[in-house]
């Protein structure tokens, strides 16, 4: 941009600087040259000489008009055509921006990551503001009324050693350019209700020999929670079908899941827990794929039989994703939920 | 309640440095975000640096690359750090609670002098 330039005169933009995409703008330049009165005065736009809507105001004084200006940035200068000089002589020059007020901040969550060692606070901004938006965090304890202020931009980590005064807190995000300010709702939150387990993993996976073979998954997590609740999501590669089975886990000891399953087939395994009776979820773990083995003599395989579980299982629901384009977005097909919690939340689908 | 103080104020030549201080009490300093203010003679609040609880630094086109702004949690002092001063600082600053933005100030001190002048 023009930002250290040695002007011989003046430009100004009404309604300023930075205005509102789509606005009518005006521009003035006004020379202030020794030994030179102008023929004309031009006005360049990003290096490009402008050709309409220009109007000379008076000797000194000239303004162009910009109808609907909507380009984000733009870098304005203009010069002066003086009697007997070959090249134009340099005016002034500005940088220019156009863009919206921000949004009101949405979906503000706030989670703690076992271990982590930080609260962290995400939310959507919103549409594109186009120029600099601030995103100030406010988090105020309902205990000592103190208040705490973060700068962000979409996201924030809050150490919980800054959390130590009190347990409930109000969090809420500001945003902030120079053509506007929203605040989003502000979110109630208990450091204990927050907590996400330590991640969760599928280590491996086996299929037994038995005359009915079942496929045993192995899992773990370093958590430190006693209540944890956790899903387990499997599907064949090749179907857009999710099963979900549910279980109530201790991981003193690492976990073993019994299913079975189809023969000679190849299955996408994923697991995800949150504390029981809280509403925070861990993502969904790495797939895991697993082989199952080709069937050994004639067996009368159903795959609708209740599939047995080392853990208490509630139930078996099915999710499928609406489209290979789409992998996020989940829909439920099927479903009996016990525990009153959607089993769709949070998917992050693999084909 | 909360108290803020200035100083360190002064005259000083163009091109010269300063170090402002801001003695801070009535509330926890350490989680706390702080800015530095100023205004100019028949001039408005103008922001010219703020910290927030997490350290995190910010500063006005007007002032980047000659201030620091700097948060004692042990001394419970705010600084300000200000180098290769020009003509235009000449202002009364203030060191205030809150971030520079957002009508988020919550007070502010007395403020201290600043006068650049040859």
């Known amino acids: 941009g023009i930002t250290s330039i040695n002007c011989s005169g003046d430009m100004w933009v009404e309604p300023g600087e930075i205005f509102q995409m789509g606005m009518n703008v005006s521009i003035y330049c006004q020379e202030a040259l020794k030994h030179c009165r102008p023929r004309n005065l031009y006005f360049y736009k990003n290096g490009f000489k402008e050709e309409f809507d220009i109007t000379r105001i008076n000797r000194t004084t000239a303004r162009i008009w910009y109808k609907g200006f909507s380009e984000p940035h733009a870098y304005m200068h203009c010069t002066a055509e003086c009697p007997g000089h070959f090249q134009e002589t340099l005016i002034c020059g500005k940088d220019i921006s156009s863009g919206h007020p921000p949004d009101a901040p949405s979906n503000l969550t706030c989670v703690i990551y076992e271990y982590s060692g930080n609260m962290t606070c995400t939310w959507n901004t919103g549409k594109p503001t186009y120029i600099d938006t601030k995103y100030i965090v406010h988090v105020k304890s309902l205990e000592t009324e103190e208040e705490q202020q973060y700068l962000a931009s979409s996201y924030v980590k809050i150490s919980t050693d800054s959390l130590q005064g009190s347990r409930k807190y109000l969090v809420w995000v500001q945003a902030v350019n120079s053509l506007g300010m929203e605040n989003s709702q502000q979110l109630h939150v208990h450091l204990d209700d927050i907590v996400i387990p330590s991640a969760s993993i599928i280590s491996r996976a086996e299929t037994t020999n038995d005359t009915v073979p079942k496929t045993i998954v192995y899992w773990k997590s370093k958590t430190m929670i006693e209540k944890v609740f956790c899903e387990m999501r499997y599907k064949t590669t090749t179907n857009q079908t999710w099963s979900v089975k549910e279980f109530d886990a201790n991981f003193t000891y690492v976990q073993q899941s019994e299913f079975y399953l189809e023969p000679d087939s190849k299955y996408v395994f994923q697991v995800r827990c949150q504390e029981t009776g809280k509403r925070n979820w861990q993502p969904w773990s790495s797939p895991f794929v697993h082989q199952t083995s080709q069937e050994t003599g004639k067996r009368n395989w159903q795959p609708w039989s209740s599939p047995f579980v080392h853990q208490t299982s509630q139930t078996v629901s099915q999710v499928t994703a609406k489209s290979s384009h789409e992998p996020q977005k989940m829909e439920m097909l099927s479903a009996t939920i016990f525990r009153g919690h959607p089993a769709s939340g949070n998917h992050q689908d693999i084909g | 309640q909360v108290q803020l103080q200035e100083s360190g104020g002064g005259l000083v030549q163009p091109g010269g440095s300063l170090r402002l201080s801001c003695a801070a009490s009535?509330?926890?300093?350490?989680?706390?975000?702080m800015t530095w203010v100023r205004q100019a003679p028949g001039k408005g609040l103008d922001w010219v640096s703020g910290?927030?609880?997490?350290?995190?630094?910010v500063y006005a086109d007007s002032v980047k690359g000659r201030a620091t702004i700097l948060k004692d949690n042990a001394k419970n002092t705010l600084y300000l750090q200000m180098n290769s001063l020009k003509t235009e600082d000449t202002a009364v600053y203030y060191c205030a609670t809150g971030l520079p933005w957002g009508n988020t100030w919550r007070t502010r001190g007395q403020g201290t002098q600043v006068t650049v002048s040859s």
């Open positions: 910290i927030d609880s997490g350290g995190t630094t």
């Open positions: 009535g509330f926890t300093f350490s989680s706390s975000a």
